[in-house]
Structures are given as structure tokens and as C-alpha cells.
Interface confidence: low
């Protein structure tokens, strides 16, 4: 019966001991709701059939209603195209007319909505971009579409979602779904795995020079991962770059220039959607002295007929610390002359007339003397005791 | 374009291993995420394996994990796919696939997401 029952229970003991109930019954019969007011609020899924490319309606109610004109079985109205409404009666034994009109508003096809990857690739290490993206077109009105994301514990209500301040090598799940008329018809999942990050900077441990043209750099590998390291090094304005393996721990640097300063960079970078430079570890050294090169452009012109005006150029290369000019001056084997200036500009005066000289001009750098320059030049007569004629030699 | 042609397979015993290869030609191969789906007799096709651009990345179906192993050699242009400690029920005809949506966020395990497919392989594990 559709009647509603209204029951009171008495119970009393029976001289057993056991429990006799005894009820009675008052028969009311209250008046049925209608069916519109009973599914005023019915909700509806839309469930998409991919080769017939039409949608099943699934209407969200606890018993078994019939649907008018429109054959529904099991609560599901079937075969309907998309973005075209479709009117739906609906009755139940529980309810009295009217009937419940409902008029389903169909979604579009869901292979016209296509998840997209937005993330920039510079950016992939530490952001992802998600988006909704319309390939084809149809004739819903688009106002009516809203999407929702879900990530971790972060709901949004837009097409695109970017997420930033991500860690790297992370894997994050993102659900999505498109609703119509507020009525879901589509939803989709991503796992994403964040790029690689850049890796840490790594720890130099030494950074020092032991010889002239020699320097040497050890350190320890930064903790994320890598695939190889770039070691510079610059004196002055050149700058010389090396891609080292990534197991090594040590460089040792060849042919330096003597007595400079070279300034290290060392980073680590990994090849990932791009390449990825992680910071540089920074350190310099001084590499130690050596000879300086050979002074040149040495001339040695008389001023007198026993003295001598000697001038050179620098080295090219100083490989020290100080500037000093040596000029010697010798006869046969013998030393006769040892000057040091700082300049090389000698003047040698009161020399023997008509004698031979050897004449060495170095530089010294205040560690090392450099090669000497050798030119040969001899005095002449003495003009002033013989006013009957001169003699050049 | 990518074409890919797939190697190995084969009938196995219950317990034993195989290799399946997957050798791409056409363009570079290292822009592209690869994955290994199959398809049993009157089954719908399943998510096996999966592994992004770089090798840095890769995916397994929970029947599988720890007895396959997807790898790729990018130099070789060629993916594969370990397979260990094979079962009866890992009798299927295994494809391999490619597709070219890297950045980030394909869904690796989704079959229609992929572009280019090989022409498949049969593997028979018989108890």
C-alpha cells in the first residue's frame, strides 16, 4: 500500500519471561508529491560513446523512473547529439502529475577538447601549465563551459592553470574536468614529472698555482644530478672555457702564462629540455714567476769616441714581479762595466779608446734574470790627441 | 614522421625473459616520449611501460613493475623493453609507440595520446 504508517508499540512480559510486543496501527493516508516537485533538483552525467560520437544521459535518482515519450532504461536516456537540447517527462508511482519536465541541455563532444601542455620549456624544472584547448568547433554555447582542475590540494576554476615554485624531478598528478551547464561530460589526468633542475654549485676545495705554468683546482660535485662541468679560466680579458667529464673531482691547467692572476669559474649544467647551468663556485691563484723573456730592439750608439749610449726595449713577457734593466759590459773575458737601472737607457762613459766591448742587456724581474741581448761595439781613437786626423772605427 | 619497427618476441617459458626492441626512423628520436602497450585475445589494450625524451623519467602498470624495465638508447634511435620473470597472463601482442608531446605533461599512460605506433609483436609465455 501507499499508505504512510503511523505505529505505537506497547511491550509487556509474558509469564515466560519473554517479550511480547503488541502494536497498534492507525491508517493515514497523506497526499503524494508531484513529480515535478519530487525531481525538481534532479542532477544528470553525460557519458560520451566515442564511435557513435553521442551522449547518454544518466539521470541521478534512486528508483526506477519512466520518461515520457523519450525510452529511458535503468535511468539512463540514451543517443543523444551533442550540443542539441532534448525535453525528458519524468514520472514515478511515488509522485502524481505534473510530471517533471526536464530538458537536457547536451554537452559537446568530448574529442573537441584536447588537455594541452603549456609549460615553457626554460621553465619546466619548477612549473607546469595545463590547459584546455578547443580543436574543433561546435555549436554549445561556450559561456556555458566551465573547467576544473584539481592538483595535489590546489582546485582551479580556469582553462589554464599554471603552477610555479615546483621542485624538480618531482612528480605531480593533476584531474581535470569539463562541465556544461554545470553538468560534468569530460575529465582527464596528467602525472607530471618536473624537469631537471639546475644542479648546486660545487664546493672548490684548492685552487692554487706550484709552478709557472701550472695551476691546479679540486672540488667536490654538486648533490643533484648533472652531466658535466664547464671550468673557465681568465687573465686579464681572455677567457678560456673547458668542458670537463662529470666524474672528475680535479683539473690540472696547463701552459699558464707565468706571474698572473687567473680567476676560476667552475659550474656544473645538465642537458634537460634545455641546458641548465647551476652556479659557479668562483677562485683565482697567481701562478708563480719564471725568466722573463730576452729584451729587444737593443741599440748602442757612441756619444763620445770612449762613450756609449745603450737603450733596449722590455721583454714581451715580464713573468715577474719587478722591472729592473742589467747592462753588462765586458773586454776580452773581463767585466768592466755592471749597471742596473730602471729604465734600459745606460750611458756608459770613460771607456778604453779604441777597444772592443761586449755589451749584454737583460731584464730581471726580481726572481729570474732574463736572456741577455748581445751586441758588439768598439771605441775610437781618442780625436782630441790626434787633431791631425780622425779615425771611425 | 617517425616510422618504428619493432624486433624480439617470441614464445617463452613461464619464468623466463625476453627483449623487445623498438627502432625508430625518419626524424630525431630523442625528441620523442616512447611507450609499450598490449593487447590480449579479447582483451582491450593496456598500459605496459612508458618513459620520457630524456631515459630520466619512466612508468610502469602495477602488473608489471619490478619485472619489466623500459630503457632507450637515443644514439641507437631504439627503445626497449625488459621483460623478467614472465607469467601466463603476459601472453599478448606488445606495441610500441612514440609521440612528440614531451614538454612536461603528456599522460604517458594513454594510449590515444601517442602518434606513431609499431606493427606490433607477439609474445607466448606457456606455463
Known amino acids: 500500500s501507499d499508505a504512510y504508517l503511523n505505529a505505537s508499540e506497547t511491550t509487556t512480559l509474558s509469564p515466560s519471561g519473554s517479550a511480547v510486543i503488541s502494536t497498534t496501527t492507525i491508517a493515514t493516508t497523506p497526499s503524494k508529491p508531484t513529480c515535478d516537485e519530487k525531481y525538481a533538483n534532479i542532477t544528470v552525467d553525460y557519458l560520451y560513446n566515442k564511435e557513435t560520437k553521442l551522449f547518454t544521459a544518466k539521470l541521478n535518482v534512486n528508483e526506477n523512473v519512466e520518461c515520457g515519450n523519450n525510452t529511458c532504461t535503468n535511468n539512463e536516456v540514451h543517443n543523444l547529439t551533442e550540443c542539441k537540447n532534448a525535453s525528458v517527462s519524468i514520472s514515478h508511482n511515488s509522485c502524481t502529475a505534473p510530471d517533471k519536465t526536464l530538458i537536457l541541455d547536451v554537452p559537446p563532444g568530448v574529442e573537441k577538447f584536447q588537455l594541452h601542455d603549456c609549460t615553457q620549456v626554460e621553465k619546466a624544472d619548477t612549473t607546469i601549465c595545463l590547459k584546455w584547448k578547443n580543436i574543433e568547433t561546435f555549436t554549445c554555447d561556450t559561456q556555458n563551459i566551465t573547467y576544473r582542475f584539481q592538483c595535489g590540494n590546489m582546485i582551479f576554476d580556469n582553462k589554464e592553470i599554471k603552477l610555479e615554485n615546483l621542485e624538480p624531478e618531482h612528480e605531480y598528478k593533476c584531474d581535470s574536468e569539463i562541465l556544461y551547464n554545470n553538468h560534468k561530460f569530460t575529465n582527464a589526468s596528467k602525472i607530471i614529472k618536473t624537469d631537471f633542475g639546475s644542479p648546486g654549485e660545487p664546493q672548490i676545495i684548492f685552487c692554487r698555482s706550484e709552478a709557472a705554468h701550472q695551476g691546479v683546482i679540486t672540488w667536490n660535485p654538486p648533490q643533484r644530478s648533472f652531466h658535466n662541468f664547464t671550468l673557465c679560466y681568465i687573465k686579464e680579458t681572455e677567457k678560456d672555457c673547458l668542458n670537463l667529464d662529470k666524474n672528475l673531482i680535479k683539473y690540472d691547467l696547463q701552459n699558464l702564462k707565468p706571474y698572473t692572476k687567473y680567476v676560476l669559474s667552475l659550474h656544473a649544467y645538465i642537458i634537460a629540455k634545455v641546458q641548465r647551468n647551476g652556479s659557479a663556485a668562483m677562485c683565482h691563484f697567481t701562478t708563480k714567476s719564471a725568466p722573463p723573456s730576452q729584451v729587444w730592439n737593443m741599440t748602442v750608439s757612441m756619444t763620445s769616441d770612449n762613450s756609449m749610449h745603450v737603450k733596449c726595449r722590455p721583454p714581451r713577457d715580464r713573468n715577474g714581479p719587478h722591472e729592473r734593466y742589467h747592462l753588462e759590459v765586458e773586454a776580452g773575458n773581463t767585466l768592466v762595466r755592471n749597471e742596473s737601472h730602471k729604465n734600459c737607457d745606460f750611458r756608459v762613459k770613460d771607456l778604453q779608446y779604441s777597444t772592443d766591448y761586449t755589451f749584454k742587456a737583460y731584464f730581471h724581474n726580481g726572481d729570474y734574470p732574463g736572456e741577455p741581448f748581445i751586441l758588439h761595439h768598439s771605441t775610437s781613437y781618442n780625436s782630441k790627441a790626434h787633431h791631425h786626423h780622425h779615425h771611425h772605427h | 614522421q617517425v616510422q618504428l619497427q619493432q624486433f624480439g618476441g617470441g614464445l617463452v617459458q613461464a619464468g623466463g625473459s625476453l627483449r623487445l626492441s623498438c627502432a625508430a626512423s625518419g626524424r630525431t628520436f630523442s625528441g620523442y616520449a616512447m611507450g609499450w602497450f598490449r593487447q590480449a585475445p579479447g582483451k582491450e589494450r593496456e598500459f605496459v611501460a612508458a618513459i620520457n625524451w630524456s631515459g630520466g623519467s619512466t612508468y610502469y602498470a602495477d602488473s608489471v613493475k619490478g619485472r619489466y624495465t623500459i630503457s632507450r638508447d637515443n644514439a641507437k634511435n631504439t627503445g626497449y623493453l625488459q621483460m623478467n620473470s614472465l607469467k601466463s597472463e603476459d601472453t599478448a601482442v606488445y606495441y610500441c609507440?612514440?609521440?612528440?608531446?614531451?614538454?612536461?605533461?603528456?599522460?604517458?599512460?594513454?594510449?590515444?595520446?601517442?602518434?606513431?605506433w609499431g606493427q606490433g609483436t607477439l609474445v607466448t609465455v606457456s606455463s
Open positions: 609507440a612514440a609521440s612528440d608531446w614531451v614538454v612536461g605533461g603528456i599522460s604517458l599512460m594513454n594510449g590515444a595520446e601517442y602518434k606513431y
